[in-house]
Interface confidence: medium
Protein backbone atom coordinates (compact mmCIF):
# COMPACT_ATOMS: atom_id res chain seq x y z
CA UNK A 1 0.00 0.00 0.00
CA UNK A 2 0.73 3.29 -0.53
CA UNK A 3 2.38 5.53 2.49
CA UNK A 4 -0.96 7.95 1.78
CA UNK A 5 -0.26 10.41 4.16
CA UNK A 6 2.57 12.00 1.51
CA UNK A 7 0.56 10.91 -1.42
CA UNK A 8 -1.09 13.87 -1.29
CA UNK A 9 -1.80 17.42 -2.82
CA UNK A 10 -3.79 20.10 -0.74
CA UNK A 11 -7.28 20.71 -2.66
CA UNK A 12 -6.08 24.58 -2.93
CA UNK A 13 -3.14 23.47 -5.49
CA UNK A 14 -6.55 22.92 -7.81
CA UNK A 15 -8.69 25.51 -6.83
CA UNK A 16 -5.86 28.58 -8.11
CA UNK A 17 -9.03 30.16 -11.21
CA UNK A 18 -5.94 31.80 -13.44
CA UNK A 19 -2.94 28.74 -13.42
CA UNK A 20 -6.11 26.09 -14.31
CA UNK A 21 -7.34 28.11 -16.59
CA UNK A 22 -3.35 28.55 -18.42
CA UNK A 23 -3.11 24.86 -17.60
CA UNK A 24 -6.17 24.56 -19.78
CA UNK A 25 -5.22 26.76 -22.85
CA UNK A 26 -2.25 25.14 -22.48
CA UNK A 27 -3.69 21.80 -23.57
CA UNK A 28 -5.84 23.17 -26.20
CA UNK A 29 -3.54 24.68 -27.76
CA UNK A 30 -1.60 21.52 -28.01
CA UNK A 31 -4.50 19.27 -28.83
CA UNK A 32 -5.07 21.72 -32.24
CA UNK A 33 -1.76 20.50 -33.35
CA UNK A 34 -1.96 16.96 -32.51
CA UNK A 35 -3.37 15.30 -35.81
CA UNK A 36 -3.01 11.50 -34.04
CA UNK A 37 -6.70 11.24 -32.34
CA UNK A 38 -6.63 7.46 -32.53
CA UNK A 39 -4.31 7.23 -29.20
CA UNK A 40 -5.38 8.54 -25.83
CA UNK A 41 -2.26 8.53 -22.85
CA UNK A 42 -4.36 9.28 -20.12
CA UNK A 43 -7.33 6.83 -19.70
CA UNK A 44 -8.86 3.73 -18.50
CA UNK A 45 -5.60 1.62 -19.56
CA UNK A 46 -3.35 3.75 -17.99
CA UNK A 47 -5.57 2.91 -14.28
CA UNK A 48 -5.92 -0.98 -15.16
CA UNK A 49 -5.40 -3.05 -12.31
CA UNK A 50 -4.12 0.05 -10.06
CA UNK A 51 -6.59 0.43 -6.69
CA UNK A 52 -7.60 4.09 -6.20
CA UNK A 53 -5.08 4.18 -3.74
CA UNK A 54 -2.40 3.83 -5.44
CA UNK A 55 -3.67 5.87 -8.02
CA UNK A 56 -1.23 9.14 -6.62
CA UNK A 57 1.61 7.63 -7.08
CA UNK A 58 0.71 6.30 -10.56
CA UNK A 59 0.21 10.10 -11.40
CA UNK A 60 3.43 11.08 -10.22
CA UNK A 61 5.51 9.08 -12.25
CA UNK A 62 3.15 10.43 -15.25
CA UNK A 63 3.72 13.66 -14.13
CA UNK A 64 7.68 13.48 -13.50
CA UNK A 65 7.83 12.19 -16.83
CA UNK A 66 6.11 14.67 -18.39
CA UNK A 67 8.28 17.33 -17.26
CA UNK A 68 11.39 15.59 -17.61
CA UNK A 69 10.87 14.08 -20.98
CA UNK A 70 7.93 16.50 -22.43
CA UNK A 71 7.84 19.62 -21.07
CA UNK A 72 11.45 20.47 -20.57
CA UNK A 73 12.37 20.40 -23.77
CA UNK A 74 9.23 21.29 -25.40
CA UNK A 75 8.87 24.51 -23.42
CA UNK A 76 9.51 26.92 -26.00
CA UNK A 77 6.08 25.97 -27.62
CA UNK A 78 2.77 27.30 -26.92
CA UNK A 79 3.94 30.37 -25.26
CA UNK A 80 2.91 32.28 -22.92
CA UNK A 81 0.99 29.53 -21.37
CA UNK A 82 3.93 27.05 -20.83
CA UNK A 83 6.31 29.50 -19.30
CA UNK A 84 3.94 29.64 -16.45
CA UNK A 85 2.28 26.32 -16.73
CA UNK A 86 5.91 24.55 -16.23
CA UNK A 87 7.02 25.94 -12.68
CA UNK A 88 3.04 25.10 -11.52
CA UNK A 89 3.52 21.25 -12.12
CA UNK A 90 6.91 21.01 -10.95
CA UNK A 91 5.87 22.35 -7.87
CA UNK A 92 2.99 19.79 -7.73
CA UNK A 93 5.96 17.51 -8.72
CA UNK A 94 8.39 18.68 -6.09
CA UNK A 95 5.01 18.47 -3.17
CA UNK A 96 4.69 14.76 -4.31
CA UNK A 97 8.47 13.72 -4.18
CA UNK A 98 7.99 11.61 -0.93
CA UNK A 99 5.23 9.84 -2.16
CA UNK A 100 5.93 6.47 -2.46
CA UNK A 101 4.63 2.68 -2.95
CA UNK A 102 5.94 -0.08 0.17
CA UNK A 103 5.84 -3.09 -1.81
CA UNK A 104 5.66 -4.24 -5.21
CA UNK A 105 4.73 -1.29 -7.35
CA UNK A 106 5.32 -3.60 -11.07
CA UNK A 107 1.82 -2.97 -12.01
CA UNK A 108 1.72 0.64 -11.79
CA UNK A 109 5.72 0.77 -13.63
CA UNK A 110 4.33 -1.34 -15.90
CA UNK A 111 1.61 0.99 -17.18
CA UNK A 112 3.77 4.13 -17.01
CA UNK A 113 5.72 2.70 -19.03
CA UNK A 114 3.28 1.49 -21.91
CA UNK A 115 2.36 5.50 -21.52
CA UNK A 116 6.26 6.53 -22.41
CA UNK A 117 6.96 3.81 -24.94
CA UNK A 118 3.59 5.49 -26.70
CA UNK A 119 5.08 9.13 -25.99
CA UNK A 120 8.52 7.64 -27.49
CA UNK A 121 7.32 5.77 -30.37
CA UNK A 122 5.22 9.08 -32.05
CA UNK A 123 8.17 11.06 -31.31
CA UNK A 124 7.63 14.77 -31.60
CA UNK A 125 3.62 14.00 -32.05
CA UNK A 126 3.33 12.01 -29.16
CA UNK A 127 5.12 14.60 -26.82
CA UNK A 128 2.43 16.94 -28.57
CA UNK A 129 -0.26 14.54 -27.89
CA UNK A 130 1.19 14.83 -23.68
CA UNK A 131 0.80 18.30 -23.60
CA UNK A 132 -2.53 18.09 -25.36
CA UNK A 133 -3.65 16.01 -22.45
CA UNK A 134 -2.20 18.28 -19.84
CA UNK A 135 -5.81 19.12 -18.91
CA UNK A 136 -6.38 15.54 -18.43
CA UNK A 137 -3.40 15.21 -16.06
CA UNK A 138 -4.39 18.00 -13.83
CA UNK A 139 -7.68 16.06 -13.65
CA UNK A 140 -6.48 13.17 -12.73
CA UNK A 141 -4.01 14.58 -9.91
CA UNK A 142 -6.81 16.01 -8.90
CA UNK A 143 -9.00 12.80 -8.56
CA UNK A 144 -6.24 10.85 -7.18
CA UNK A 145 -4.31 12.90 -4.82
CA UNK A 146 -6.64 15.24 -3.27
CA UNK B 1 35.77 21.79 -27.18
CA UNK B 2 32.50 22.61 -25.32
CA UNK B 3 33.41 25.80 -23.98
CA UNK B 4 31.38 29.20 -22.40
CA UNK B 5 33.13 32.64 -22.56
CA UNK B 6 31.79 35.42 -20.53
CA UNK B 7 32.62 39.06 -21.47
CA UNK B 8 31.19 42.56 -20.20
CA UNK B 9 32.24 42.62 -16.49
CA UNK B 10 33.16 45.37 -14.97
CA UNK B 11 33.12 48.83 -12.31
CA UNK B 12 29.48 50.30 -12.62
CA UNK B 13 28.32 53.06 -10.04
CA UNK B 14 24.66 52.26 -8.39
CA UNK B 15 21.91 52.68 -10.79
CA UNK B 16 24.25 52.27 -13.68
CA UNK B 17 23.84 49.62 -16.16
CA UNK B 18 25.96 46.49 -18.21
CA UNK B 19 25.83 43.98 -20.45
CA UNK B 20 27.10 40.59 -20.19
CA UNK B 21 27.23 38.56 -23.09
CA UNK B 22 28.43 34.57 -22.90
CA UNK B 23 29.95 33.29 -26.10
CA UNK B 24 29.23 29.26 -26.82
CA UNK B 25 31.30 27.01 -28.96
CA UNK B 26 31.34 23.22 -29.35
CA UNK B 27 27.78 22.28 -28.68
CA UNK B 28 24.28 22.98 -30.21
CA UNK B 29 24.01 26.00 -28.77
CA UNK B 30 20.37 26.86 -30.01
CA UNK B 31 18.91 23.06 -28.30
CA UNK B 32 20.30 23.89 -24.65
CA UNK B 33 18.62 26.39 -22.35
CA UNK B 34 21.30 28.23 -20.55
CA UNK B 35 21.67 29.96 -17.30
CA UNK B 36 22.98 32.93 -15.30
CA UNK B 37 23.96 32.26 -11.93
CA UNK B 38 26.36 34.98 -9.58
CA UNK B 39 28.44 34.59 -6.94
CA UNK B 40 29.62 37.23 -4.52
CA UNK B 41 32.90 37.81 -3.38
CA UNK B 42 33.72 34.70 -0.72
CA UNK B 43 29.99 33.95 -0.71
CA UNK B 44 27.95 30.90 -2.46
CA UNK B 45 26.09 30.58 -5.43
CA UNK B 46 23.19 31.89 -6.64
CA UNK B 47 20.74 31.44 -9.27
CA UNK B 48 20.21 34.90 -11.08
CA UNK B 49 18.36 34.00 -14.42
CA UNK B 50 17.30 31.10 -17.25
CA UNK B 51 16.27 31.07 -20.69
CA UNK B 52 14.54 28.45 -22.50
CA UNK B 53 15.92 26.87 -26.11
CA UNK B 54 14.95 29.39 -28.53
CA UNK B 55 14.08 32.28 -25.95
CA UNK B 56 9.90 31.67 -25.86
CA UNK B 57 10.48 31.47 -22.21
CA UNK B 58 12.34 33.48 -19.64
CA UNK B 59 13.26 33.02 -15.53
CA UNK B 60 14.16 35.75 -13.02
CA UNK B 61 14.64 35.04 -9.39
CA UNK B 62 12.93 37.47 -7.56
CA UNK B 63 16.22 39.20 -5.98
CA UNK B 64 17.01 40.38 -9.78
CA UNK B 65 13.37 40.65 -11.23
CA UNK B 66 12.28 43.58 -13.43
CA UNK B 67 16.09 44.73 -13.44
CA UNK B 68 18.27 42.32 -15.36
CA UNK B 69 16.87 40.35 -18.11
CA UNK B 70 17.96 37.14 -19.75
CA UNK B 71 18.41 36.89 -23.46
CA UNK B 72 20.23 34.65 -26.52
CA UNK B 73 20.58 35.28 -30.11
CA UNK B 74 20.94 31.89 -31.69
CA UNK B 75 22.44 32.68 -34.85
CA UNK B 76 25.34 34.12 -33.08
CA UNK B 77 25.91 31.15 -30.69
CA UNK B 78 25.60 33.87 -27.27
CA UNK B 79 23.85 34.76 -24.62
CA UNK B 80 23.33 37.74 -22.78
CA UNK B 81 22.29 39.53 -19.70
CA UNK B 82 21.17 42.65 -19.37
CA UNK B 83 21.67 44.51 -16.02
CA UNK B 84 19.76 47.76 -14.92
CA UNK B 85 19.57 49.96 -11.83
CA UNK B 86 22.32 48.13 -10.55
CA UNK B 87 22.84 48.05 -7.13
CA UNK B 88 25.74 47.08 -4.06
CA UNK B 89 24.33 43.93 -3.29
CA UNK B 90 24.85 42.96 -7.14
CA UNK B 91 28.36 42.91 -7.05
CA UNK B 92 29.78 39.22 -7.77
CA UNK B 93 31.39 37.11 -11.00
CA UNK B 94 28.76 36.39 -13.01
CA UNK B 95 28.81 32.66 -14.91
CA UNK B 96 27.02 31.12 -17.77
CA UNK B 97 25.88 28.16 -17.39
CA UNK B 98 24.80 25.19 -20.17
CA UNK B 99 21.16 23.94 -18.92
CA UNK B 100 18.48 21.42 -19.87
CA UNK B 101 18.21 20.40 -23.28
CA UNK B 102 17.72 16.82 -25.74
CA UNK B 103 20.43 15.19 -27.39
CA UNK B 104 19.79 11.91 -29.38
CA UNK B 105 20.70 10.25 -26.33
CA UNK B 106 18.95 12.16 -23.60
CA UNK B 107 17.79 14.96 -22.05
CA UNK B 108 20.61 16.43 -19.87
CA UNK B 109 19.43 18.34 -17.15
CA UNK B 110 21.65 19.90 -14.84
CA UNK B 111 24.62 22.64 -15.27
CA UNK B 112 26.76 20.89 -16.82
CA UNK B 113 29.24 23.34 -18.69
CA UNK B 114 30.11 26.74 -16.87
CA UNK B 115 32.18 29.73 -18.63
CA UNK B 116 35.28 30.96 -16.14
CA UNK B 117 32.73 34.09 -15.10
CA UNK B 118 33.14 38.00 -15.22
CA UNK B 119 33.69 40.23 -12.15
CA UNK B 120 30.79 42.78 -12.18
CA UNK B 121 31.42 45.92 -9.58
CA UNK B 122 28.54 48.25 -8.13
CA UNK B 123 30.25 50.53 -6.09
CA UNK B 124 30.28 54.61 -6.10
CA UNK C 1 12.25 28.89 -1.79
CA UNK C 2 14.08 25.48 -1.14
CA UNK C 3 16.83 26.34 1.43
CA UNK C 4 19.68 24.15 1.09
CA UNK C 5 22.08 23.90 4.23
CA UNK C 6 25.50 22.36 3.90
CA UNK C 7 27.46 20.60 6.94
CA UNK C 8 30.57 20.92 7.94
CA UNK C 9 31.39 24.62 6.79
CA UNK C 10 35.06 23.57 6.58
CA UNK C 11 35.99 20.21 6.80
CA UNK C 12 40.12 19.37 7.79
CA UNK C 13 41.24 15.75 6.22
CA UNK C 14 44.73 14.07 5.60
CA UNK C 15 45.43 12.93 1.75
CA UNK C 16 44.10 9.32 1.70
CA UNK C 17 41.35 9.80 4.16
CA UNK C 18 37.91 9.34 3.26
CA UNK C 19 35.85 12.54 3.52
CA UNK C 20 32.18 12.76 4.23
CA UNK C 21 30.52 15.64 3.08
CA UNK C 22 26.67 16.54 4.54
CA UNK C 23 23.81 18.60 2.40
CA UNK C 24 20.44 19.04 3.82
CA UNK C 25 17.29 20.53 1.94
CA UNK C 26 14.43 22.48 3.81
CA UNK C 27 11.53 20.05 2.20
CA UNK C 28 12.05 17.09 -0.01
CA UNK C 29 13.74 17.44 -3.24
CA UNK C 30 13.29 13.92 -4.12
CA UNK C 31 16.55 12.73 -5.71
CA UNK C 32 17.00 16.17 -7.99
CA UNK C 33 20.33 16.87 -6.41
CA UNK C 34 24.02 17.59 -7.76
CA UNK C 35 27.52 18.62 -6.48
CA UNK C 36 29.66 21.17 -7.85
CA UNK C 37 33.30 21.48 -6.96
CA UNK C 38 34.79 24.73 -6.90
CA UNK C 39 38.34 25.73 -6.95
CA UNK C 40 39.64 29.10 -6.07
CA UNK C 41 39.36 31.47 -9.26
CA UNK C 42 37.89 28.55 -11.18
CA UNK C 43 34.35 28.39 -12.36
CA UNK C 44 32.14 25.14 -10.78
CA UNK C 45 32.45 22.08 -12.15
CA UNK C 46 29.14 19.52 -12.11
CA UNK C 47 30.41 15.94 -10.31
CA UNK C 48 27.83 14.41 -9.54
CA UNK C 49 23.69 14.68 -11.10
CA UNK C 50 20.35 12.77 -9.88
CA UNK C 51 22.21 12.06 -6.07
CA UNK C 52 24.28 9.35 -7.26
CA UNK C 53 24.88 9.85 -11.05
CA UNK C 54 28.88 11.01 -11.95
CA UNK C 55 29.36 13.34 -14.57
CA UNK C 56 31.31 13.22 -17.06
CA UNK C 57 34.90 13.13 -16.30
CA UNK C 58 34.03 12.67 -12.31
CA UNK C 59 36.37 10.03 -10.91
CA UNK C 60 35.08 7.05 -9.39
CA UNK C 61 36.21 7.97 -5.85
CA UNK C 62 33.64 10.37 -5.92
CA UNK C 63 30.12 9.05 -4.98
CA UNK C 64 26.96 10.69 -3.95
CA UNK C 65 24.02 8.84 -1.76
CA UNK C 66 21.16 10.07 -0.09
CA UNK C 67 16.99 10.90 -1.30
CA UNK C 68 14.46 13.16 -0.24
CA UNK C 69 16.08 15.79 2.30
CA UNK C 70 19.43 14.04 3.07
CA UNK C 71 22.11 13.83 0.76
CA UNK C 72 26.03 13.12 1.14
CA UNK C 73 29.62 13.24 -1.26
CA UNK C 74 31.87 10.61 -0.26
CA UNK C 75 35.23 11.21 -1.49
CA UNK C 76 36.89 7.55 -0.99
CA UNK C 77 40.66 8.02 -0.78
CA UNK C 78 41.25 11.61 -1.00
CA UNK C 79 43.91 13.47 -3.75
CA UNK C 80 46.06 16.71 -3.46
CA UNK C 81 43.67 17.82 -6.19
CA UNK C 82 40.42 17.40 -4.39
CA UNK C 83 41.01 19.67 -1.82
CA UNK C 84 38.22 22.32 -3.05
CA UNK C 85 34.83 23.76 -1.73
CA UNK C 86 32.00 21.61 -2.46
CA UNK C 87 28.50 23.38 -3.27
CA UNK C 88 24.75 21.00 -3.47
CA UNK C 89 22.03 22.22 -5.53
CA UNK C 90 18.67 21.24 -6.16
CA UNK C 91 16.73 21.27 -9.21
CA UNK C 92 13.51 20.11 -7.94
CA UNK C 93 11.90 23.43 -7.41
CA UNK C 94 12.48 24.20 -11.20
CA UNK C 95 13.55 27.10 -12.29
CA UNK C 96 14.21 28.10 -8.70
CA UNK C 97 18.02 26.63 -8.04
CA UNK C 98 19.30 27.33 -4.84
CA UNK C 99 22.67 25.92 -3.66
CA UNK C 100 24.12 25.06 -0.08
CA UNK C 101 26.68 27.71 0.70
CA UNK C 102 29.52 25.14 0.55
CA UNK C 103 31.93 23.32 2.49
CA UNK C 104 35.85 23.55 2.19
CA UNK C 105 37.91 20.97 2.43
CA UNK C 106 40.99 21.61 3.34
CA UNK C 107 44.40 19.71 4.00
CA UNK C 108 44.94 18.30 7.59
Known amino acids: APISSHCRLDKSNFQQPYITNRTFMLAKEASLADNNTDVRLIGEKLFHGVSMSERCYLMKQVLNFTLEEVLFPQSDRFQPYMQEVVPFLARLSNRLSTCHIEGDDLHIQRNVQKLKDTVKKLGESGEIKAIGELDLLFMSLRNACI | EVQLLESGGGLVQPGGSLRLSCAAS????????MSWVRQAPGKGLEWVSTITSSGGATYHADSVKGRLTISRDNSKNTLYLEMNSLRVEDTAVYYC?????????????????WGQGTLVTVSS | EIVMTQSPAILSVSPGERATLSCRAS??????LAWFQQKPGQAPRLLIY???KRATGTPARFSGSGSGTDFTLTISSLEPEDFAVYFCQQRSDWPQYTFGQGTKLEIK
Open chain 3, 50 to 52: DTS
Open chain 2, 97 to 113: AKDWGRTVYAVIKDLDI
Open chain 3, 27 to 32: QSVSNY
Open chain 2, 26 to 33: GFTFSTYA
